[in-house]
C-alpha cells in the first residue's frame, strides 16, 4: 500500500478515535506505526516524494504528541492536530486530483 493511502486511512481512523470515541490512547496506537514507518525511511521514489512533501509536518506533529504525553497539556494535542489536518487536506486534494 502506498504511504499516502496508509496515512489517509490512518488519519481517518485517528479522527474517528479522537473526535468520535474520545479515545486519545487509541488514536496514538493508530498513528505510532505510521510514524515508525516514516522513521525507517523511504524505500521507493514514491515514498521519497511523500517524505519530501509531508515528512516535516508529520515529524513535527509527532513531537507535539510526545509533548502532550509528557505534559498532558491539551494545547500540545491541538498543535499536533493542526498539522495532521493540514497533511490530511493536502493528501486528499492531491489524491483526488490524480484520480
Amino acid at each position: 500500500i502506498l504511504w499516502h493511502e496508509m496515512w489517509h486511512e490512518g488519519l481517518e481512523e485517528a479522527s474517528r478515535l479522537y473526535f468520535g470515541e474520545r479515545n486519545v490512547k487509541g488514536m496514538f496506537e493508530v498513528l505510532e506505526p505510521l510514524h515508525a514507518m516514516m522513521e525507517r525511511g523511504p524505500q521507493t521514489l514514491k515514498e521519497t516524494s511523500f517524505n519530501q512533501a509531508y515528512g516535516r509536518d508529520l515529524m513535527e506533529a509527532q513531537e507535539w504528541c510526545r509533548k502532550y504525553m509528557k505534559s498532558g497539556n491539551v494545547k500540545d494535542l491541538t498543535q499536533a492536530w493542526d498539522l495532521y489536518y493540514h497533511v490530511f487536506r493536502r493528501i486528499s486534494k492531491h489524491h483526488h486530483h490524480h484520480h
Epitope: 488519519l11 481517518e12 479522527s15 474517528r16 479522537y18 473526535f19 468520535g20 470515541e21 474520545r22 491539551v74 494545547k75 491541538t78 498543535q79 492536530w81 493542526d82 489536518y85 490530511f88 487536506r89 486528499s92
Partner: antibody, heavy 123, light 107 residues
Framework: EVQLVESGGGLVQPGGSLRLSCAAS????????IHWVRQAPGKGLEWVAS????????SYADSVKGRFTISADTSKNTAYLQMNSLRAEDTAVYYC????????????????WGQGTLVTVSS | DIQMTQSPSSLSASVGDRVTITCRAS??????VAWYQQKPGKAPKLLIY???SLYSGVPSRFSGSRSGTDFTLTISSLQPEDFATYYC?????????FGQGTKVEIK
C-alpha cells in the same frame, strides 16, 4: 437519502419521565454517532448527549448526567433518550443529529438533523 | 468546558451586504469548529466544517476562516434567504459547545 425522525415528546409534570426516539434511515446506523441537542424556547442550542452505535460509548452534559440515558438499538436503526426526574428547565425542542468525525465526510460536525420534538415540563 | 463567545448577538443588514460573524474559543480547539444556519421552527443546517471547509450544497457566498482561537463566518453578499440565526460550535472536546447565536435581520 439520510433521514432522522424524532418522536416521543409531549407534556410531562416535574419529576416525571419521557423517552424520546430517533429513527434513522439512509445511512449505516451501526457505525454511526448520534447526538441529542436541545433548544429551549427562544434560546440557543445546547448539546445533551452522544452515543457511538458501534462501541456504545456515551457522553452527557453535566446538566443531565444521572437523569438522562442515551441508548441505541442497531436492529431497529433507532437511538433513544430516556429522560427521568424532569425539571422545568428541561423544556425544549429536542433534536437528534448525526455526528461525523472525519474531515473527508464533512466533520467533525453535525451534518444531518431531525425535525425536533417538543418536550414541555410543567405542572 | 470550552466557551464559544459569539458576536454580535444580532445585526441588521441589507441584501447584497457583506456580513461577518465571529466566534472566540476560550481555549485552543484546533480547526474543530462548525457553523450552522437556523431558521424559525426549523432544525439547524451545516454550512462550514473544520473551520473553513464549505459543506456540500452550500452556496459559495458562505466562507469560514480561522486565526488561532478566533473563527469567522462571512457571507460575501447577503441574499433574502440568508436572514436567519447562525451558530458556531466546537467539537474539540466534550461537552460539545455552541456559541450563543447571531440573528441576522433585515435592515
Amino acid at each position: 437519502e439520510v433521514q432522522l425522525v424524532e418522536s416521543g415528546g409531549g407534556l410531562v409534570q416535574p419529576g416525571g419521565s419521557l423517552r424520546l426516539s430517533c429513527a434513522a434511515s439512509g445511512f449505516n446506523f451501526s457505525s454511526s454517532y448520534i447526538h441529542w441537542v436541545r433548544q429551549a424556547p427562544g434560546k440557543g442550542l445546547e448539546w445533551v448527549a452522544s452515543i457511538s452505535s458501534s462501541s456504545s460509548s456515551t457522553s452527557y452534559a453535566d446538566s443531565v448526567k444521572g437523569r438522562f440515558t442515551i441508548s441505541a438499538d442497531t436492529s431497529k436503526n433507532t437511538a433513544y433518550l430516556q429522560m427521568n426526574s424532569l425539571r422545568a428547565e428541561d423544556t425544549a425542542v429536542y433534536y437528534c443529529a448525526r455526528y461525523v468525525y472525519s474531515y473527508s465526510q464533512g466533520g467533525p460536525a453535525f451534518d444531518y438533523w431531525g425535525q425536533g420534538t417538543l418536550v414541555t415540563v410543567s405542572s | 468546558d470550552i466557551q464559544m463567545t459569539q458576536s454580535p448577538s444580532s445585526l441588521s443588514a441589507s441584501v447584497g451586504d457583506r456580513v461577518t460573524i465571529t466566534c472566540r474559543a476560550s481555549q485552543s480547539v484546533s480547526s474543530a469548529v462548525a457553523w450552522y444556519q437556523q431558521k424559525p421552527g426549523k432544525a439547524p443546517k451545516l454550512l462550514i466544517y473544520s473551520a473553513s471547509s464549505l459543506y456540500s450544497g452550500v452556496p459559495s457566498r458562505f466562507s469560514g476562516s480561522r486565526s488561532g482561537t478566533d473563527f469567522t463566518l462571512t457571507i460575501s453578499s447577503l441574499q433574502p434567504e440568508d436572514f436567519a440565526t447562525y451558530y458556531c460550535q466546537q467539537s474539540w472536546s466534550v461537552p460539545i459547545t455552541f456559541g450563543q447565536g447571531t440573528k441576522v435581520e433585515i435592515k
